[in-house]
Interface confidence: low
């Protein structure tokens, strides 16, 4: 049998912190009681706790957890989301730069094209940011574009001067000209592998940061079970129904019970091991095609080069398109 | 080659960004980041330990508490759970993850597929184009100078001028991060429970 | 109807070269990556090379490098696989396979070949 | 190139449950299972670890715990007495399969 309680003893310094937390003070004994109905804090002798207070420490003891779990990620949470969005904000700086780049190309080196050029332009670096940002966009469908519309307005402009301006019934054949003869040699190929190869890895790099956000969040928010609320209970508010209002759990046992608590979040941790360290991988390579900094900041001269090309073999093609788009032609000059 | 089109940017900011040689790069802010983030490899599995020694735990105190009764901090007892007739800790830990937690790992599983996908050399990823050969060949200097292109005229070196944090609003330190003590924070009474 | 149908086996000698044929049907070929698997008589399945969807990548099993190549024409859905330098342990029933495309948020990846096709007998014999 | 274990056989009665386990796949990459009915070609059977193809009935299953995974049959019906091949990538992303289980149905 568990000795009384002195003849003295109260649940006054019980109550006065019980305050704190449930300022109805109906629920906290006078005197020491058997607790008989206690689930929680099992009694040795008598108790200052009720069944009431049992669950309201158990509650408390659940949002003391959620709120240590936030604080404990808060620094790592902060980390991602801000790399998140600077890393969002400079690709898509590269991507208008490299519009600037390539229009300040056109402007200077070719101004007879520049305001087809520009529209051109425009539209495939804007499908280069949806890309990034996730649009299921073909990178190849996106080159191709851009090289079919310029060709027409390169051939009309450049190569062929006299050829009137609404020269529209020509366009569709120009722009089926354009792939099967190769008027611009390899260099669409080119821009298709490093484009592709550089804003890949660059989407799958944000696509991964997002996640990680996602990941802490998961975490952060979780909701601790019954059973958990229950042994955090007995570890930070068992020990004031025994009127032991100063002592503080021990170390050891504070670990066992965090560690049954958080078995379910910790088996995240090989996962998150291997996702620094894979993303890390990926850092490490993104530099040369790899990178879309160094790929799209180029591309205006690549695409400079490819118009010398068709340039370089304009004689040829003149004539080859002549006969070819002949028909187009004839329908435009009646 | 092209003429190098730096004078043409109408944005003042991008010229200044254009200009300036010592930020950062957005190559550096990337590894910066890993370096960051592998100071968090083991979050996950230090979590019980930083919970409690976040929390209040016996460190200097003779006696402690574990569950049952004041026992001395460096007894046998002291390691016990004390919850041998209300619940078991192991069945706890069989229950496994929440459904939330499986799909996350889920999700982590997958995007590290990708991650080591795209970055083996030959990654076998499916869009088109993303291992054409013959582009990457020759040596093209290092990481600030790289090849882009090439015809007839010979490669082009394009010189990465951009230094990307003059122009970036998010210039915060992780230091200078909200809220950023590592302590609970309490919002209000009803959370802010622990009495020392 | 998701089809897959080889053709081109035969009866060579050692030291041949035969070619496979794979005519692909129901699905738009150029997007999804293509392997061939083989199965000698009484054995297990044994992958013995891949190519991915523009064709630009290839893999191959160490028991085949050097020897076999794969390859693929996406105007004509049709994947091949050219053997040369056949050896008795070659002889198999070939199969090509669809690389199942799984879909995670925007990116694609191998998850597995989720369409067969009936197989194409070579025995490689003198 | 990397190996997936498998056992050689098998055998349950109709209306039972078997497990045939494949381990060794240590590259981190998801496990998929494969049935090959006698004189037909393999067919896809379990991707993902434990994802079904719409047609697969939902008596077959997979798991996957660290470098062995299995799949698991219950109920079992004469009709799937088979071949089973595991299948993942090794490290270089190439396909490895596992050397096959028969199944027999007693």
């Known amino acids: 049998q568990p000795p009384p309680p002195p003849p003295d003893a109260t649940c006054h310094q019980v109550r006065s912190f019980f305050q704190r937390l449930q300022p109805g003070l109906k629920w906290v004994p006078e005197t020491p009681v058997p607790g008989s109905d206690l689930q929680v804090c099992l009694p040795k002798g008598p108790t200052c706790c009720s069944r009431k207070m049992e669950e309201k420490y158990q509650l408390t003891a659940r949002l003391n957890m959620e709120q240590l779990l936030q604080s404990a990620s808060m620094e790592l949470k902060f980390l991602i989301i801000q790399n998140a969005a600077v890393f969002q904000e400079a690709f898509e700086i590269v991507v208008r730069h490299a519009k600037n780049y390539t229009n300040a190309m056109f402007k200077n080196n070719y101004p007879s094209l520049t305001p087809q050029a520009f529209e051109f332009v425009g539209e495939f670096f804007t499908d280069v940011s949806l890309y990034i940002l996730g649009s299921d966009i073909n990178v190849d469908d996106m080159v191709n574009e851009l090289f079919d519309s310029l060709f027409p307005v390169i051939y009309t402009q450049l190569m062929n001067p006299g050829l009137p301006d609404s020269a529209l019934d020509i366009n569709e054949c120009l722009r089926g000209a354009r792939r099967d003869l190769k008027v611009f040699g390899n260099f669409p190929k080119l821009i298709m592998t490093q484009v592709s190869k550089s804003l890949q890895v660059t989407r799958i790099f944000l696509q991964a940061l997002n996640l990680g956000i996602e990941v802490i969040n998961t975490t952060d928010h979780l909701k601790f079970s019954k059973d958990c609320g229950r042994m955090l209970t007995r570890m930070w508010y068992c020990s004031y129904c025994q009127g032991l209002m100063m002592v503080k759990p021990c170390g050891g046992y504070c670990n066992v019970v965090m560690q049954g608590c958080m078995a379910g979040v910790v088996e995240i941790d090989k996962y998150w091991r291997e996702y620094i360290l894979s993303l890390e991988e990926l850092v490490n390579g993104m530099y040369r095609i790899y990178d879309m900094e160094n790929v799209l900041l180029g591309l205006f001269s690549t695409i400079h080069d490819s118009i010398q090309y068709v340039q370089k073999n304009a004689g040829k093609l003149t004539t080859t398109i002549g006969k070819l788009c002949a028909h187009s032609q004839q329908r435009q000059y009646r | 080659s092209a003429y190098y089109p730096e004078d043409l940017f109408i944005d003042k900011k991008v010229l200044k960004v254009a200009h300036v040689e010592h930020e950062e790069t957005l190559s550096s802010r990337r590894r910066e980041l890993i370096q960051k983030l592998k100071s968090f490899i083991s979050f996950y599995s230090a979590l019980p330990g930083y919970i409690c020694s976040h929390s209040p735990v016996a460190e200097n105190d003779t006696l402690c508490w574990n569950g049952q009764e004041l026992v001395e901090r460096y007894s046998q007892k002291a390691a016990r759970n004390g919850m041998k007739n209300q619940f078991n800790l192991h069945e706890l830990k069989m229950k496994g993850p929440e459904p939330v937690v499986s799909q996350i790992i889920d999700k982590l599983k997958h995007i590290n597929q990708l991650l080591r996908t795209m970055s083996m050399p030959k990654g076998r990823v499916l869009d088109k184009n993303l291992d054409e050969e013959g582009f990457e060949s020759g040596d093209c200097g290092d990481d600030e100078d790289e090849c882009i292109g090439g015809s007839g005229d010979g490669m082009i070196k394009v010189k990465n001028q951009l230094r990307f944090l003059a122009e970036l609003a998010y210039d915060l330190d992780v230091d200078d991060a909200p809220g950023n003590s590592q302590q609970a924070t309490p919002k209000d009474n009803e959370i802010s429970t622990f009495h020392n | 109807e998701v089809q897959l149908v080889e053709s081109g086996g035969g009866l060579v000698q050692p030291g041949g070269s035969l070619r496979l044929s794979c005519a692909a049907s129901g699905f738009t070929f150029k997007d999804y990556a293509m392997s061939w698997v083989r199965q000698a008589p009484g054995k297990g399945l044994e992958w013995v090379s891949a190519l991915s969807g523009s064709g630009g990548a290839t893999y191959y099993a160490d028991s085949v490098k050097g020897r076999f190549t794969i390859s693929r024409d996406n105007s004509k859905n049709t994947l091949y696989l050219q053997m040369n330098s056949l050896r008795a342990e070659d002889t198999a029933v070939y199969y090509c396979?669809?690389?199942?495309?799984?879909?995670?948020?925007?990116?694609?990846?191998?998850?597995?070949?989720?369409?067969w096709g009936q197989g194409t007998t070579v025995t490689v014999s003198s | 190139q990397s190996v997936l274990t498998q056992p050689p056989s098998v055998s349950g009665a109709p209306g039972q449950r078997v497990t045939i386990s494949c381990t060794g796949s240590?590259?981190?990459?998801?496990v998929h299972w494969y049935q090959q009915l006698p004189g037909r070609a393999p067919k896809l059977l379990i991707y993902g670890s434990n994802n079904r193809p719409s047609g697969v009935p939902d008596r077959f299953s997979g798991s996957n715990s660290g470098t062995s995974a299995s799949l698991a049959i219950t109920g079992l019906q004469a009709e799937d007495e088979a071949d089973y091949y595991c299948q993942s990538y090794d490290s270089s992303l190439n396909a490895i399969f596992g050397g096959g289980t028969k199944l027999t149905v007693l």
């Open positions: 240590s590259s981190g990459y998801d």
């Open positions: 396979a669809k690389e199942m495309d799984f879909r995670y948020g925007w990116m694609h990846y191998y998850y597995g070949m989720d369409v």
